[in-house]
């Protein structure tokens, strides 16, 4: 198992349909043609798994059908998108990136988007 | 290393608005937020708000809402505070401070407005 | 929102005594609670992030505890470069919020 450099960014809002997407970007060290990526949520030192991917360089990433997050891929770069948020789901969201195939299989894991969420505002009762 | 400045010192009438800026280096400025708090003379620290400045989407205090607008501009990494139809208790120094994962870790210098006719 | 209190409001300490600063949270926030000190006509500044973990160049001398609701900043041997006001803040949901600090000064 080979270590390699994983970046995201430190912070980002969700927006106020609970909906963020951020960046993982990787730094290949080689040809990766079978990716595996997973987003992990960090929240007082309990790690659970929130979605996993594998995707074949230049596919779509393919996450389960039940499954909060989607995503796209750019080269080294996936742009992750988690919906359904809510205010308890603040939280830090930590991607995960093994290149499974060919070998050597590398890992890498960043240090975590802080994702903010706050529940919108309820509206007001209408007469209608 | 972590700097945050910020734009000099205004005096407005009331009913007027007033824009502060504060430019940040020695990080990337879209990994993380901007918050914007304020303190009155004498007073404790009072939050308004932030912007994250990776997809320019904002929170703001209920207090400040409809009154406040934060933008950033990621091309000179700097970030824009607007507070409009001031009145004499906005009198304060207006702080910016960078948002990460853990709250707010560091400041800007301040910004003293003051409202008076 | 999440309301802080802190206690004291004020505290007149004589070089290296220890000073003990609580702040309580009106609802659990696991460890997102930090500490600033802010000195007179200054910004404030990081002392203790997460409830204990010390921020790059701050003096050993600060340290912080607690989790849920209740947290401590404890000043080992004051010097009196340390007279300031002390603010506890809340990261653990929006809106952030700041306690009403603590004004510590030398006698």
């Known amino acids: 198992c080979k270590a390699m450099h994983v970046a995201q960014p430190a912070v980002v809002l969700a927006s106020s349909r609970g909906i963020a997407s951020f960046v993982c970007e990787y730094a290949s060290p080689g040809k990766a043609t079978e990716v595996r990526v997973t987003v992990l949520r960090q929240a007082d030192s309990q790690v659970t798994e929130v979605c996993a991917a594998t995707y074949m360089m230049g596919n779509e990433l393919t996450f389960l059908d039940d499954s909060i997050c989607t995503g796209t891929s750019s080269g080294n770069q996936v742009n992750l998108t988690i919906q359904g948020l809510r205010a308890m789901d603040t939280g830090l969201y930590i991607c995960k990136v093994e290149l499974m195939y060919p070998p050597p299989y590398y890992l890498g894991i960043g240090n975590g988007t802080q994702i903010y969420v706050i529940d919108p505002e309820p509206c007001p009762d209408s007469d209608f | 290393q972590v700097q945050l400045v910020q734009s000099g010192p205004e005096v407005k009438k009331p009913g007027a608005s007033v824009k502060v800026s504060c430019k940040a280096s020695?990080?990337?400025?879209?990994?993380?937020?901007i918050g914007w708090v304020r303190q009155a003379p004498g007073q404790g620290l009072e939050w308004m708000g932030w912007?994250?400045?990776?997809?320019?989407?904002?929170n703001y205090v209920q207090k400040f809402q409809g009154r406040v607008t934060m933008t950033t501009d990621t091309s000179t990494s700097t970030a824009y505070m607007e507070l409009r139809s001031l009145r004499s208790d906005d009198t304060a120094v207006y702080y910016c401070?960078?948002?990460?994962?853990?709250?707010?870790?560091?400041w800007g210098q301040g910004t003293l407005v003051t409202v008076s006719s | 929102e999440i309301v802080l209190t802190q206690s004291p409001d004020f505290q007149s300490v004589t070089p290296k005594e220890k000073v003990t600063i609580t702040c309580r949270a009106s609802?659990?926030?696991?460890?997102?609670l930090h500490w600033y000190q802010q000195k007179p006509d200054q910004s404030p500044k990081l002392l203790i992030k997460?409830?204990?973990q010390s921020f790059s160049g701050v003096p050993s001398r600060f340290s912080g505890s607690g989790s849920g609701t209740d947290f401590t900043l404890t000043i080992n041997s004051l010097e009196a470069e340390d007279a300031a006001t002390y603010y506890c803040?809340?990261?653990?949901?929006?809106?952030?919020?700041f306690g009403p600090g603590t004004k510590v000064d030398i006698k």
């Open positions: 401070a960078r948002v990460g994962a853990s709250g707010v870790d560091y």
């Open positions: 020695g990080y990337t400025f879209t990994s993380y937020g």
């Open positions: 912007i994250s400045a990776y997809n320019g989407n904002t």
């Open positions: 609802q659990n926030i696991g460890s997102s």
């Open positions: 997460y409830a204990s």
């Open positions: 803040h809340q990261s653990s949901s929006l809106p952030f919020t």
